[in-house]
């Protein structure tokens, strides 16, 4: 039920996960866990934010965007074979579990022996910061309690976070916007 | 391999406190949030509390909120409920639970509490 | 709170049959449910996370599937062994709440 997001051996991976701070120096914390989301928290985490800065990060794992705008998409540098599987993106937004989690599939692929060499796929165009959706309906709307000191308008993330499955099957490897009442 | 040896349980009076404990092994303890879930007698399971991994975030199912405290030794590799004001509705079988990837991924074989004049 | 609701509490089978446990949310939970085997005076056992995922050591008989408010656990050929209560737990948010369980019982 996860999209998949593929990279092959030797190149960097990319697994998109966004939201949008109320202003940029109003950060929330956000963990990156190897494995499926937890219950709570992050388990097995390979790298984390606070309100201010990444405050814990492993090797070959980093922030590539502007973190402080809210893309805190995950790069990993390198990858092996052994770097395939699910990862959790946890917006730990304030509040008792009001968390948003996304569980992110990678699939690493074997590295192609081709005689030239081709062009890496752009992910600008792949993973658009905002997706305007149409036909099926809109992204998942989620409410939270009252969040005073955040105010979040807008978590994106992958298109396997959408209700609506046929919408899914449609934005297949591309971002798309849950919008926070 | 992830072990997970609950104690502590035992037969108690109504309004009695019980202190249960679990002590953990096979993993890095401090990395995972862990868990009580409970069943009573003839029941379903029942999320209890939870504790993040530094033990500085705690969690309570409403039933319990301000009756029970979750808090662990990670030096000891050891979890704790302290139970105070038990009730007859407490009586359960409860379970030590570790919070790995996708959930509640290893269960210990539970302590029973009986709350009974 | 969002609630979890399966099929049925409990439902008679045969060894060899295919076995399907349904379980509904009230809300959309994306994919953050697990299924859980409990046999009585033993430890809940995961058989299934993040909604389809197998758990490790399981069974390729056991199947998960779903996402959004539907979700569905199936035992393709049921084995003496699997005589048991399955349950769902939802845990996109708090608190994580559990399916009232299901006993598959032998017919």
């Known amino acids: 039920s996860e999209v998949e997001y593929r990279a092959e051996v030797g190149q960097n991976a990319y697994l998109p996960c966004f939201y949008t701070p109320a202003a940029p120096g109003n950060l929330v914390p956000v963990c990156w866990g190897k494995g499926a989301c937890p219950v709570f928290e992050c388990g097995n985490v390979v790298l984390r934010t606070d309100e201010r800065d990444v405050n814990y990060w492993t090797s070959r794992y980093w922030l590539n965007g502007d973190f402080r705008k809210g893309d805190v998409s995950l790069t990993i540098e390198n990858v092996t074979l052994a770097d395939s599987g699910i990862y959790c993106c946890r917006i730990q937004i304030p509040g008792i579990m009001n968390d948003e989690k996304f569980n992110l599939k990678l699939v690493i692929k074997p590295a192609k022996v081709t005689p030239a060499p081709t062009r890496q796929r752009d992910f600008t165009a792949a993973f658009p910061r905002m997706l305007t959706t149409r036909g099926h309906g809109p992204a998942e709307t989620q409410t939270l309690g009252s969040l005073p000191d955040i105010n979040l308008t807008q978590i994106s993330t992958l298109a396997n976070e959408l209700r609506d499955s046929r919408l899914a099957n449609d934005l297949r490897d591309s971002g798309a916007t849950i919008r926070i009442g | 391999q992830v072990q997970l040896v609950e104690s502590g349980g035992g037969l108690v009076q109504p309004g009695g406190s019980l202190r249960l404990s679990c002590t953990a092994s096979?993993?890095?303890?401090?990395?995972?949030?862990m868990s009580w879930v409970r069943q009573a007698p003839g029941k379903g399971l029942e999320w209890v509390s939870a504790?993040?991994?530094?033990?500085?975030?705690?969690y309570y199912a409403d039933s319990v909120k301000g009756r029970f405290t979750i808090s662990r030794d990670n030096s000891k590799n050891t979890l704790y409920l302290q139970m105070n004001s038990l009730r007859a509705e407490d009586t359960a079988v409860y379970y030590c639970?570790?919070?790995?990837?996708?959930?509640?991924?290893?269960w210990g074989q539970g302590t029973l509490v009986t709350v009974s004049s | 709170d969002i609630v979890m609701t399966q099929s049925s509490s409990s439902l008679s089978a045969s060894v060899g049959d295919r076995v399907t446990i349904t379980c509904r949310a009230s809300?959309?939970?994306?994919?953050?449910l697990g299924w859980y085997q409990h046999k009585p005076g033993k430890a809940p056992n995961r058989l299934i996370y993040?909604?389809?995922s197998l758990q490790s050591g399981v069974p390729s008989r056991f199947s998960g599937s779903g996402s959004g408010t539907e979700f569905t656990l199936t035992i393709s050929s049921l084995q003496p062994e699997d005589f048991a209560t399955y349950y769902c737990?939802?845990?996109?948010?708090?608190?994580?709440?559990f399916g009232q369980g299901t006993k598959v019982e032998i017919k």
């Open positions: 096979g993993f890095t303890f401090s990395s995972y949030a």
């Open positions: 993040a909604a389809s």
């Open positions: 737990l939802r845990h996109n948010s708090y608190p994580p709440t």
């Open positions: 639970v570790k919070d790995g990837a996708g959930g509640f991924d290893y």
């Open positions: 809300q959309g939970i994306i994919n953050h």
């Open positions: 504790i993040g991994g530094s033990g500085g975030s705690t």
